[in-house]
């Protein structure tokens, strides 16, 4: 749809005569009839297929025609068409004399024609005004013409309909060729698709208006590129939603079980080496000179009673020193200068000669020891406590203080690892020599039956339209992450374009 515009500029009829040569009385009151039709190989009479238009009387004999378009007048003349502009045309312009006020063709005598032109033209839409001049022996007509598209029509032939809009059906203006030009922040064939916040994750984020980034279920963050871990996940992360992948040293369904007590709590003191030995369990290997479960006690080197034969021990910075009683010598007072004649055996010990009387040995009664039976027996010297238990002298008896996880007189019994019910989800616990083993019920696996396996809500592929399915382990349900263009709990509904557009 468009308009052929004809601008009449000047008509010259100096002698004021009709086509027949007869003069007009008193002068030629001139008006024009315009016929626009399809291009003809030879311009020929026939219907004005593209339209006709007439002017009022514009002047007498010779006159310039003023541009009247700004005042809503009739110059340029408008010949609207509602078809694809073909690019070529035939144009007939007749100048007529109006003796009276009635300008209808049937009201005029046939010889009222002043002049007539008929041309074949070629004209592209939007071209500048094309100036033409037709001269005969008596008259001259100067005129120009152009073709423009009607509002909302575009393209070389005014055949492309485009109406700018900024609503649910599109956000665009129209380019000169009729193609859509999306308003800032919009994209897509009809500019209906908002351009989300720059960097907004293509799959995990979406938007309903420009520069927005709304997250699909299971995702968070400004750009929806951070997954939401399983509800209650303590020391874990995720790479897809609802996961809880434990950080190093943590275990369990919610990564809240400490598998690396050494690193997290540093229980061993005085430079001891810490070894993890199970959940919240550890062993400290002490450096020389230290003892205790956590190597928190400093050992005196004299505590081991290294001095024999009643020698007294003195701690020194670089070790210890034995002060020997009379008759003894050596690093530990282990050498005697006495013989049985000197009655060297105390506490009822009996003396036996050795090396032809040069030496002796004492045979001590029970509860005494030492080369001269001078020491009461320390029941702890034989390290009777197993599994790192600490031996304590209690008068004539002794007792073992056991490390966590052990019991019995000598700490020889493992406390059942199963006592704490470590197997999750109803798993059966079995004590082993150095640890435990869980036998898991159907649907669970892992060292402690903490991993859900078979109850997979996504196994039945409940999501439609290529949506991604995520299992929510806490509720045994699924969540569908819809691709662009679909909604619904199973992504079953398309966000479809309406079937037709009202423009």
């Amino acid at each position: 749809s468009g308009v052929f515009q004809l601008q009449l500029q000047e008509f010259i009829n100096e002698r004021g005569v009709l086509a027949s040569g007869r003069p007009c009385e008193p002068g030629c009151r001139t008006f024009f009839r315009v016929c626009l039709k399809h291009f003809q190989a030879v311009v020929s009479p026939g219907p004005c297929t593209f339209g006709t238009v007439s002017t009022p009387v514009l002047g007498t004999n010779s006159f310039a025609v003023r541009d009247d378009s700004s005042g809503g007048g009739r110059n340029p003349l408008q010949l609207p068409f509602n078809f694809t502009w073909p690019g070529t045309f035939s144009l007939i312009i007749e100048a007529w004399h109006a003796p009276g006020d009635d300008l209808r063709p049937e009201a005029l005598p046939p010889d009222a024609l002043i002049s007539k032109i008929a041309i074949q033209g070629s004209l592209a839409v939007g071209q500048n005004w094309l100036l033409d001049e037709q001269t005969s022996t008596l008259t001259r007509l100067r005129y120009s013409y152009r073709v423009i598209c009607s509002d909302n029509y575009y393209g070389d032939n005014c055949s492309r309909l485009c109406k700018k809009r900024n609503d649910h059906f599109g956000h665009y203006v129209c380019q000169p060729d009729g193609n859509l030009s999306c308003l800032p922040g919009w994209t897509g064939e009809y500019c209906q698709q908002p351009i989300c916040l720059s960097g907004c994750h293509e799959q995990n984020g979406y938007c309903s208006k420009p520069a927005e980034c709304l997250c699909r279920p299971g995702w968070q963050g400004r750009l929806c590129n951070e997954c939401i871990p399983h509800n209650g996940c303590r020391h874990g992360t995720c790479s897809t939603p609802w996961q809880c992948t434990c950080d190093e040293g943590w275990g369990g369904l919610f990564c809240d079980q400490d598998l690396n007590y050494c690193t997290h709590h540093s229980p061993c003191k005085n430079g001891a080496t810490c070894s993890n030995s199970g959940q919240r369990s550890y062993t400290c290997t002490c450096r020389p000179g230290y003892t205790g479960v956590d190597c928190e006690l400093e050992l005196s080197e004299c505590d081991s009673n290294p001095c024999r034969n009643g020698g007294s021990c003195k701690d020194q910075e670089d070790g210890y020193h034995c002060l020997c009683p009379p008759g003894y010598y050596g690093l530990h007072c282990e050498h005697s200068t006495l013989s049985c004649a000197d009655s060297p055996c105390f506490n009822g010990g009996s003396c036996r000669e050795r090396n032809q009387g040069a030496n002796y040995a004492c045979e001590c009664p029970p509860n005494f020891t030492g080369s001269n039976c001078e020491k009461k027996v320390d029941r702890c010297t034989s390290n009777p406590c197993a599994n790192g238990g600490q031996c304590l002298n209690r008068g004539p008896s002794r007792m073992c203080r056991c490390r966590p996880g052990f019991t019995g007189t000598y700490c020889e019994l493992h406390v059942s690892d199963c006592a704490r019910n470590p197997c999750a989800h109803g798993g059966t616990c079995h004590d082993l020599e150095n640890g435990l083993m869980c036998t898991c019920p159907a649907g669970f696996s892992g060292r402690r039956c903490e991993v859900r396996t078979s109850i997979d809500a996504c196994a039945s592929s409940p999501c439609f339209n290529r949506a991604t399915c995520y299992t929510d382990l806490s509720t045994d349900t699924f969540v569908c992450n819809c691709p662009y263009g679909f909604v619904g709990s199973r992504c079953e509904f398309p966000v479809g374009l309406p079937p037709s557009f009202p423009w």
């Epitope: 190989a41 030879v42 009479p45 026939g46 070529t88 035939s90 041309i119 033209g121 001269t135 005969s136």
Partner: antibody, heavy 118, light 107 residues
Framework: EVQLVESGGGLVQPGGSLRLSCAAS????????MYWIRQAPGKGLEWVAF????????YYRDSVKGRFTISRDNSKSTLYLQMNSLRAEDTAVYHC???????????WGQGTMVTVSS | DIQMTQSPSSLSASVGDRVTITCRAS??????LAWYQQKPGKAPKLLIY???RLQDGVPSRFSGSGSGTDYTLTISSLQPEDFATYYC?????????FGQGTKLEIK
């Protein structure tokens, strides 16, 4: 008196060139579309080329496209036909004509003979 | 291209006879048709244009009719000067096409 006078015809070898002219007088040449029409000896009439009144539109019959060029000089009231790569089948009397039946205009020249032969 | 089929190709008639020549177009030419008379060695002369309009100076014994694809030239009463070759020409679309011609001879 209206006159259209063709000139420039003659004998030419195949592959050769000729330029025909048509001088108009007695009417306003610049107002009308112009045509070249030919007639081979003993044959019917055959349209060759067209040019609009201002020279902006030209048309040719398929057999001469790319070989013939129609042009006009309105200041000299003259129409031209440049003929290249001539063939034996181009042999004919060439008429120029001003045709505008809407205006009752139908002016023909007497023609100029073009013979293409080796 | 629009084909113009003219008939008959030749015709013998006597002075005073009524003669009809027809032209059929291969598609609608919307009455954009002319009839020409040509005598040997002369340029064609326009008789009828727009299917039925008589050119200035042409005797009224010549008339044209028709529309769409079928057109007729009628000479109501042949005169001695009418013996010539007659052509139809469609001016609707390029390429312009003529009929093959009808040679009107004295019987």
């Amino acid at each position: 008196e209206v006159q259209l006078v063709e000139s420039g015809g003659g004998l030419v070898q195949p592959g050769g060139s000729l330029r025909l002219s048509c001088a108009a007088s007695g009417f306003t040449f610049s107002n009308y579309g112009m045509y070249w029409i030919r007639q081979a000896p003993g044959k019917g009439l055959e349209w060759v080329a067209f040019i609009s009144h201002g020279g902006g539109i030209t048309y040719y019959r398929d057999s001469v496209k790319g070989r013939f060029t129609i042009s006009r000089d309105n200041s000299k009231s003259t129409l031209y036909l440049q003929m290249n790569s001539l063939r034996a089948e181009d042999t004919a009397v060439y008429h120029c004509a001003a045709l505008n039946w809407e205006l009752g205009i139908d002016y023909w020249g007497q023609g100029t003979m073009v013979t293409v032969s080796s | 291209d629009i084909q113009m089929t003219q008939s008959p190709s030749s015709l013998s008639a006597s002075v005073g006879d009524r003669v009809t020549i027809t032209c059929r177009a291969s598609e609608d030419i919307y009455s954009n048709l002319a009839w020409y008379q040509q005598k040997p060695g002369k340029a064609p002369k326009l008789l009828i244009y727009a299917a039925n309009r008589l050119q200035d100076g042409v005797p009224s014994r010549f008339s044209g009719s028709g529309s769409g694809t079928d057109y007729t030239l009628t000479i109501s009463s042949l005169q001695p000067e009418d013996f010539a070759t007659y052509y139809c020409l469609q001016g609707s679309k390029f390429p312009l096409t003529f009929g093959q011609g009808t040679k009107l001879e004295i019987k």
